[in-house]
């Protein structure tokens, strides 16, 4: 009988896959030491486990548990960064400020940061072709369900104050369909946290608004109120300085509005 | 119906540099990748590299210094070119089809054009 | 990157089932699909199998392809051999750069 296979609207899997993974999570178990009891063939083993012979459009977070089982990690909850839409500055900010944490400074995070993948149903083959789509093919495709379990379990763990990157070069500042508003923001637990403090990005150098006031600000305090948690925002017009100035805090021009 | 043929100089000389054109018809090179195939004489088949249907490009490692892969997709062609060429790079040059799904086989293939570096 | 390697002969007589093995160096043969190419002197090559064993419905059903996980193997089975069988067979695979791999190729010769 011959096969017939899905094209998916998707780039494919990313080259070298499996050697990625497995090179990261060497890397990172090298330079955290709290996680060097980590095996890492093991963790390919259940992250290839997850979705190879699976249908990609029928991936479960239930599929993902032996891999976050694996990859269980204490991070401090009281210094848990989130992003939405502004990846790149967050990770410059948390690998200065180096108590911060990002979803993608844990090990699960690390591992899949920036990849695709996903397997043809009933084939240990990895499919380098194309993977489905979020809003195009299917919603619980491996690399969407992947995001979804870790960010849900990130968001869990976090406590006393939590801070959020938000772009605000961005229409929609807070993005009810980013993973951030569909997942993190309700899995924030109320009674562990405290204060959820969101950060606004300028983008323009000229752009002395404040973004604070944004409808989608607004929408998002509204949200977490609702939840029995505290909203706060600060605008931060000047990405470039705000860095800086976390480098080198006693710089004089640090003390201003940044 | 797909077709697709090689065309280029039949002699080559040393440290030259070798331009191949395959032009294709039957498919539109917007939907498949086109991929170049030598075999020197009397020995095996070497994968040299491919243009994907979106215009991206890889190479075999072991040619990459040496290679670049480009096309024009209003005519249909797709063209190699070799630089610093050796004796050793004597071989049939095949350009082939890669079809638009995850098996990565050739199904259609040029007939070939030989190309002798001069010693 | 793996290797594949095939017999650099095999024979059969007339009417009679041949079977070529290509072995993968590292790594599972199930983890990428294999094909098989037929190649007449001078001629280009024709896909005979791909997907590890399907058949191009041009091709006749005396062509089969099959992995074996035990002998980290891909096989290609021609039953009823024909002279006109007598040809080069090469299998081809990928690596998870989607670099592809030909093996080294198998002269078949009928008797």
């Known amino acids: 009988v011959p096969r017939w296979r899905q094209q998916w609207s998707g780039p494919g899997t990313t080259k070298r896959f499996p050697e990625t993974v497995l090179a990261r999570c060497v890397k990172y178990t090298e330079i955290h030491p709290e996680m060097r009891h980590v095996d890492c063939q093991s963790v390919w083993d259940a992250f290839k486990g997850a979705f190879i012979s699976k249908h990609p459009c029928n991936i479960t977070e239930e599929d993902y548990q032996p891999l976050m089982k694996l990859g269980t990690q204490t991070v401090p909850c009281n210094k848990i960064l989130l992003w939405s839409r502004i990846k790149d500055l967050a990770h410059q900010f948390t690998q200065v400020q180096r108590d911060m944490f990002t979803l993608e400074d844990t090990l699960l995070g690390y591992l899949a940061d920036d990849l695709t993948w996903c397997g043809e149903f009933n084939t240990s083959k990895i499919n380098y072709q194309s993977c489905p789509d979020w809003r195009k093919d299917c919603s619980n495709n491996p690399v969407s369900v992947f995001w979804k379990t870790v960010s849900r379990r990130f968001a869990e763990a976090a406590c006393d104050v939590v801070h959020v990157m938000l772009n605000g070069s961005r229409s929609k500042i807070f993005d009810k369909n980013s993973t951030f508003g569909s997942v993190e923001v309700h899995n924030l637990q109320p009674e562990k946290v405290q204060t959820l403090e969101a950060w606004v990005i300028h983008g323009g150098r000229e752009d002395s608004r404040d973004l604070c006031q944004d409808p989608t600000i607004k929408e998002l305090e509204s949200i977490i109120s609702k939840r029995n948690i505290q909203f706060s925002c600060k605008n931060i017009y000047r990405p470039d300085k705000f860095l800086q100035c976390v480098k080198n805090p006693e710089d004089s021009s640090c003390t201003s509005e940044i | 119906q797909v077709q697709l043929k090689e065309s280029g100089p039949g002699l080559v000389q040393p440290s030259e540099t070798l331009s191949l054109t395959c032009t294709v018809s039957g498919f539109s090179l917007t939907s498949y990748g086109v991929n170049w195939v030598r075999q020197p004489p009397g020995k095996g088949l070497e994968w040299m590299g491919r243009i994907w249907n979106d215009g991206s490009i890889d190479y075999n490692s072991a040619l990459k210094s040496r290679l670049s892969i480009s096309r024009d997709t209003s005519k249909g062609q797709v063209f190699l070119k070799m630089n610093s060429l050796q004796t050793e790079d004597t071989a049939i040059y095949f350009c082939?089809?890669?079809?638009?799904?995850?098996?990565?086989?050739?199904?259609?293939w040029g007939p070939g054009t030989m190309v002798t570096v001069l010693s | 990157q793996f290797t594949l390697t095939q017999p650099k002969s095999v024979s059969g007589s007339l009417r009679s089932t041949i079977t070529i093995p290509c072995e993968r160096s590292?790594?599972?043969?199930?983890?990428?699909?294999v094909s098989w190419y037929q190649q007449h002197l001078g001629r280009p090559p024709i896909n005979v199998i791909y997907?590890?064993?399907?058949?191009p419905s041009e091709v006749s059903d005396r062509f089969s392809g099959s992995i074996d996980s035990s002998s980290n193997s891909a096989s290609l089975t021609i039953t009823n051999l024909q002279m006109d069988d007598e040809a080069d067979y090469f299998c081809q695979s990928y690596d998870s750069n989607i670099d592809i791999i030909f093996g080294g190729g198998t002269k078949l010769t009928v008797l």
């Open positions: 082939a089809r890669g079809p638009y799904n995850n098996y990565w086989y050739f199904d259609f």
């Open positions: 997907a590890d064993d399907q058949r």
């Open positions: 590292s790594g599972d043969i199930g983890d990428n699909y």
